[in-house]
Interface confidence: low
């Protein structure tokens, strides 16, 4: 006869490991007992259990409560056992020794491999600001046994670098994603994808990118200077910019205080019926935590009684 087993048994941390050992004997042969031992322990073999044809299963104190027989029906020639709740310390080499009658003793070895699925973590890099060079957007670390694979899934253009630290029974893999921040990246997802044989499916952690920026400011409302005449109602100037974080707006008049009756409503400056006192240089100041921008315009309110048109200047500064 001969023993049938597996070269390698692979289980995920916390699962039950079936250690197979089946004696395929000739007709009339019987199995008297099957002894299981761990044989890669520091000081010789460590007994797990004894499976006796007459007295049943006896588990050594070191494995009390962790070694069982597979559920019935059982073949009397099957010496397989279950190792409950595999921990990483169980990883190693095991031996079954089968005593048969009348053929004598047989032994076989297998290796138990315990997969430790990773628990990945994603750490965002420093705050991203437009104008920076190549900057760390995020790093993703996963530790497991064997070493996990860490990749990135994103539409954003960038570069990745990985490093791995091997430990006694596991390996930690860290992958970093670097990019050159631009405003178009705002709100884009950056997903760390961790693959591992102990995972049923890839683990994904998504980080939403935030890039601080502030666009140039410009003022709208003076496109048709002929509309800016004495008595006109509903005249307004609107300051245009965009940014992340969203900017705040402030209006001032360069050549004096804002005239009475002029309403400031965020990015909009609303005028009462126009008079010549509304002529002047108006400044829109746009700011967020990242930067600030100014745009100034000169308003000349036309007097229809006068024949000559006045010039309107737009000047933008930052």
């Amino acid at each position: 006869g001969e023993l049938e087993t597996s070269d390698v048994v692979t289980v995920v941390l916390g699962q039950d490991a079936k250690l197979p050992c089946f004696y395929r004997g000739d007709s009339g042969e019987q199995v008297g007992q099957v002894a299981w031992a761990r044989v890669d322990a520091g000081e010789g073999a460590q007994e797990l259990a004894l499976l006796h044809s007459k007295y049943g299963l006896h588990v050594s104190p070191a494995y009390e409560g962790r070694v069982e027989q597979p559920p019935p029906p059982r073949n009397p020639l099957d010496g397989s056992v279950l190792l409950r709740n595999a921990v990483q310390a169980d990883e190693g080499e095991y031996e079954c020794r089968v005593s048969t009658f009348p053929a004598g003793s047989f032994q076989a070895r297998l290796r138990l491999r315990v997969l430790v699925p990773p628990l990945p973590s994603l750490n965002p890099g420093p705050a991203l600001e437009e104008g920076q060079g190549l900057t760390l957007a995020a790093s993703c670390t996963a530790e497991g046994s064997p070493a996990p694979s860490v990749t990135w899934d994103t539409e954003v253009k960038g570069t990745t670098s990985s490093r791995s630290f091997k430990h006694s029974r596991s390996a930690a893999v860290t992958s970093e994603f670097h990019l050159v921040p631009s405003r178009s990246m705002n709100g884009q997802p950056l997903t760390c994808v961790v693959s591992h044989p102990g995972l049923l499916q890839d683990q994904r952690i998504t980080h939403i990118l935030h890039v601080s920026f502030l666009a140039e400011a410009s003022v709208r409302g003076l496109e048709d200077q002929n509309l800016w005449h004495i008595g006109r109602e509903g005249a307004m100037l609107k300051c245009l910019s965009e940014g992340q974080p969203p900017p705040s707006y402030n209006w001032t008049r360069l050549d004096g205080p804002l005239p009475s009756g002029v309403r400031v409503d965020g990015d909009t400056l609303g005028f009462p019926p126009l008079t010549t006192e509304h002529s002047g240089i108006y400044v829109c100041h746009v700011s967020n935590e990242f930067s600030s921008r100014d745009s100034q315009v000169t308003v000349d309110v036309l007097d229809p009684q006068e024949d000559s048109g006045k010039q309107v200047d737009l000047v933008s500064a930052s």
Epitope: G65, H167, S168
Partner: antibody
Amino acid sequence: QVQLKESGPGLVKPSQSLSLTCTVTGYSITSDYDWHWIRHFPGNMLEWMGYISFSGRTYYNPSLKSRISITHDTSKNHFFLRLNSVTTEDTATYYCARGNYDGFDYWGQGTTLTVSS
Amino acid sequence: DIQLTQSPAILSVSPGERVSFSCRASQNIGTSIHWYQHRTNGSPRLLIKFASESISGIPSRFSGSGSGTDFTLSINSVESEDIADYYCQQSKSWPTYTFGGGTKLEIK
């Protein structure tokens, strides 16, 4: 048979640096396991200080991180502890040990360190 | 950080009695707890790993139990040679570790 043995000065003055050596026999420190330093204070408290792995990676107790360094000499099968800026509160018995996250299975006999001027 | 609290600080028992040491973790650590015996003028000795797993060469009177946050080391029939300090240690926070404050065993 795995054996570990600590050696060091016994007495160190405050603000100086402490250097201890752990000599390992019966097992190569580059084969497997982590190689730890643990100390026992007079008040009967054990404190894990840090370790160097078989591959040379080090991890330290966050409370000591700014002062501690663990290195090894693989040719001699030694590993070392250096603790900077010692105070009287570092007076303790220092142990080296072998282990990982299933416990510390082999320990040295310990070396007593007194910090005093 | 995971803190381990051992109680009581001192246990006093008569030879032959059963004694239990308690260790409580500040958060769920599964079974990632190990127990050590530290005799005066000796080195700590690993008694139990992963809460209940026996260690080769350790007398069978030592046993461990528990999971989650509450753990117990028991000696089912105390002998005079068991006079020592007993410490629990967690490895859930690998690659860093912490010990409990210890319990001193005295013989009446």
